[in-house]
């Protein structure tokens, strides 16, 4: 359904509140160095442009697309070849190069000032000041620091922020009341900011049917009671919101965000018993809500999957003839049996029944050829399931800090080009998997983990993108979306590797480190970590553990003396010179 | 030394019939999928069909319903059946052997040499 | 409606140079379904890549091809004498009837 002002359609549908943050949203995750006053007076540009367009579609320039417009608008910021270098060059091209361009430029990792949480006296004080400032800039600081963040989501994150400054700064004890909330905020924040970031790599990278796969899969599961026709359907729409927001589509995405939940809650007799409490919900806590909702219960009795994708007569012929069907139709009923499968495990066992048949439907005998193809699916079962068990046991055995430290030593003994920042914050969010999913039964173990582990191995390929170092880690991130997980797992200690040269200066440690918090101190003590095994890749878990044991004491014993400075400027050398006695530096 | 060898083209005027063989030497054809090929006077290559080892065919849109493609594994043979040609079905038809290992692929490794069928009046 | 690209549908070039013939499909083509030919004048065509960057056996390193979903590349590094020929594209899509082939690509001496 075309309009004569797509930008008036939008502002329309969408409301002025909504417009402006999502306009907000898509020029800070272009411009993501741009000051946040000159990101406020380019949306308020938008905004009365929008509002013109609304009194009269046929005023100039309405009819322009918004890639258009808001292109127009980025490349009107004075100071873009200065602040983003050749970034710039994107200006001179016509859409949609120009948005492709844009869409290039965005950071994954951009050199912006770590976000330091003020008092919370003085964040209340700003809040009750100027309320929508102080929210903008919410958004701005997230939506610059996570350029993919999934913008409707952040819209309710946003909500949720306000209500916890709504709430806790008239509370007798404010920092009890607002911190916890703010943590978990952060926390659900990044991690929410990881999900969509694997959703944006699998749609440009690996394109929209491996989404598309991906979305049949995980729906299949959670509405096993619905009809493929009903997924099928779910799936093409999921598809093209989660296209637009990763185009920098925001304001399509949020818009046709909200008609598929208004589509789901109005058609929740054929989708799922589960639905209910969220579409009660308005609109933002409704679309969070249906995203995570449960898994409904499997309909009792579903046949056997081998009659319609093994014994009849019709596979190769069905398979041949319109192999999306067919095989979304294998992966469906797959999936809808098997809630305890992680997704990309349902997606492997889709490859290879494909390659089966591929493999056998010209042969002499087909059935004989494709007839054992179930038993193939057995291995890359059982895989991810003793992998699971053998890292919960460890977890279960170190706890949280020390199964991190042990994926550290693994992971850079793997991939020891990788930078030490990297190296410590994958290592870190892959030890969280234990916490995560250990806890589970041993029907949600595998959802759980091999699911959030190509999250964070996603968040490794985006970074070791921007600079490649290692052709190991460019190998498993390109060569198939679902077996990243298994790829890794399967390197071996880099021989080739070159141990770096031995700098003290890596090793000493001040006084301020008394000062960080429980997680800024584990963090210095891992990056150490990694460090040690650059330098010795070699090294014994014994002796690591040694060398770790002894650091630890050292910040302990200094950070209690009286003269900490001195304390780790003598103590230090000492540790560093037993450290390279122990390892054979 | 595996060979294709097509055969039975020629001049046939519009909306008869002809019938195209593809010889297989060197192998045994009743392992492999077959593929009938043309290509147009100065034009490029245009899939028609395939038969699998199993006796299952394919074709493409345009030539569902005129062209019908068969296999006679004792005598090492596939045929392309052609009716109601039509001037525009001028060019050299090609048999081809899909890779093994493959059944929906576009990956021909064994090609004839092509036999010219020309349609005239 | 299953279109191939291919483009430029001609180029002329000296023995030694590089040159890439690109392969646009829409939609895209099954998971990597795509195949590159030669053909030189009065013969059959030869099958040089298949799967969209394998290399047939046989078939000189100096040929490779890249790409995924609905953009693809055929380049021959160093071009010799005998690589002046036609080249094709055919790319396999969900139904195996859309099997479809480009328009060709005629490598012609400077």
């Known amino acids: 359904d075309a309009h004569k002002s797509e930008v008036a359609h939008r502002f329309k549908d969408l409301g002025e509140e909504n417009f402006k943050a999502l306009v907000l949203i898509a020029f800070a995750q272009y411009l993501q160095q741009c000051p946040f006053e000159d990101h406020v007076k380019l949306v308020n540009e938008v905004t009365e442009f929008a509002k013109t367009c609304v009194a009269d579609e046929s005023a100039e320039n309405c009819d322009k697309s918004l890639h258009t417009l808001f292109g127009d608008k980025l490349c009107t910021v004075a100071t873009l070849r200065e602040t983003y270098g050749e970034m710039a060059d994107c200006c001179a091209k016509q859409e949609p190069e120009r948005n492709e361009c844009f869409l290039q430029h965005k950071d994954d990792n951009p050199n912006l000032p770590r976000l330091v949480r003020p008092e919370v006296d003085v964040m209340c004080t700003a809040f009750h000041d100027n309320e929508e400032t102080f929210l903008k800039k919410y958004l701005y600081e997230i939506a610059r620091r996570h350029p993919y963040f999934y913008a409707p989501e952040l819209l309710f994150f946003a909500k949720r922020y306000k209500a916890a400054f709504t709430e806790c700064c008239q509370a007798a004890d404010k920092a009890a009341c607002l911190l916890p909330k703010l943590d978990e905020l952060r926390d659900e924040g990044k991690a929410s900011s990881a999900k969509q970031r694997l959703k944006c790599a699998s749609l440009q990278k690996f394109g929209e049917r491996a989404f598309k796969a991906w979305a049949v899969a995980r729906l299949s599961q959670r509405f096993p009671k619905a009809e493929f026709a009903e997924v099928s359907k779910l799936v093409t729409d999921l598809t093209k919101v989660h296209t637009e927001c990763c185009h920098g589509d925001l304001l399509e995405c949020a818009d046709d965000r909200a008609d598929l939940a208004k589509y789901i809650c109005e058609n929740q007799d054929s989708i799922s018993s589960k639905l209910k409490e969220c579409c009660e919900k308005p609109l933002l806590e409704k679309s969070h809500c249906i995203a995570e909702v449960e898994n409904d219960e499997m309909p009792a009795d579903l046949p056997s999957l081998a009659a319609d994708f093994v014994e009849s007569k019709d596979v190769c012929k069905n398979y041949a003839e319109a192999k999306d069907v067919f095989l979304g139709m294998f992966l469906y009923e797959y999936a809808r049996r098997h809630p305890d499968y992680s997704v990309v495990l349902l997606l492997r066992l889709a490859k290879t029944y494909e390659t089966t048949l591929e493999k056998c439907c010209a042969a002499a005998d087909p059935h004989e050829c494709y007839a054992k193809v179930f038993d193939e699916f057995k291995p890359l079962v059982e895989e991810p399931q003793n992998l699971i068990k053998q890292n919960c046991e460890l977890f279960e055995q170190l706890g949280e800090y020390k199964f991190q430290n042990a994926l550290l030593v693994r992971y850079t003994k793997k991939v020891p080009q990788v930078s030490t920042p990297t190296l410590v914050e994958v290592s870190r969010n892959l030890g969280k998997v234990g916490s995560k999913c250990c806890k589970h039964p041993e029907a949600k173990r595998m959802p759980c983990a091999e699911d959030y582990l190509s999250v964070v191995l996603n968040q490794l390929c985006v970074l070791h993108e921007k600079t490649p170092v290692s052709d190991r880690v460019t190998k498993c991130c390109t060569e198939s979306l679902v077996n990243r997980r298994p790829c890794f797992s399967a390197l071996e200690v880099d021989e080739t590797y070159v141990p770096k040269e031995f700098n003290a200066e890596t090793f000493t440690f001040h006084a301020d480190i008394c000062t960080l918090s429980e997680k800024e101190r584990q963090i210095k003590k891992q990056t150490a970590l990694v460090e040690l095994v650059k330098h010795k890749p070699k090294a014994t878990k014994e002796q690591l553990k040694a060398v770790m044991d002894d650091f630890a004491a050292f910040v302990e014993k200094c950070c209690k003396a009286d003269d900490k400075e001195t304390c780790f400027a003598e103590e230090g050398k000492k540790l560093v010179a037993a450290s390279q006695a122990a390892l054979g530096l | 030394e595996v060979q294709l060898l097509e055969s039975g083209g020629g001049l046939v005027q519009p909306g008869g019939s002809l019938r195209l063989s593809c010889a297989v030497s060197g192998i045994d054809l009743s392992n492999y999928a077959i593929n009938w090929v043309r290509q147009a006077p100065g034009k490029g290559l245009e899939w028609i069909g395939i038969?699998?080892?199993?006796?299952?065919?394919f074709y493409a849109t345009w030539a569902k319903g005129r062209f019908t493609i068969s296999r006679d594994n004792s005598k090492n043979t596939v045929y392309l059946q052609m009716n109601s040609l039509r001037a525009e079905d001028t060019a050299v038809y090609y048999c081809a052997r899909t890779v093994p290992g493959y059944s929906t692929a576009p990956y021909f490794d064994l090609w004839g040499q092509g036999t010219l069928v020309t349609v005239s009046s | 409606d299953i279109q191939m690209t291919q483009s430029p549908s001609s180029v002329s070039a000296s023995v030694g140079d590089r040159v890439t013939i690109t392969c646009q499909s829409s939609p895209s083509v099954w998971f990597n379904f795509l195949s590159w030919y030669q053909q030189k004048p009065g013969k059959a065509p030869k099958l040089l890549i298949y799967?969209?960057?394998k290399l047939t056996s046989g078939v000189p390193s100096r040929f490779s091809g890249s790409g995924s979903g609905t953009d693809f590349t055929l380049t021959i590094s160093s071009l010799q004498p005998e690589d002046f020929a036609t080249y094709y594209c055919?790319?396999?899509?969900?139904?195996?009837?859309?099997?479809?082939f480009g328009g060709g690509t005629k490598v012609e001496i400077k």
């Open positions: 055919g790319g396999g899509y969900s139904s195996i009837s859309d099997t479809t």
């Open positions: 799967e969209a960057s």
């Open positions: 038969i699998w080892a199993s006796g299952t065919t």
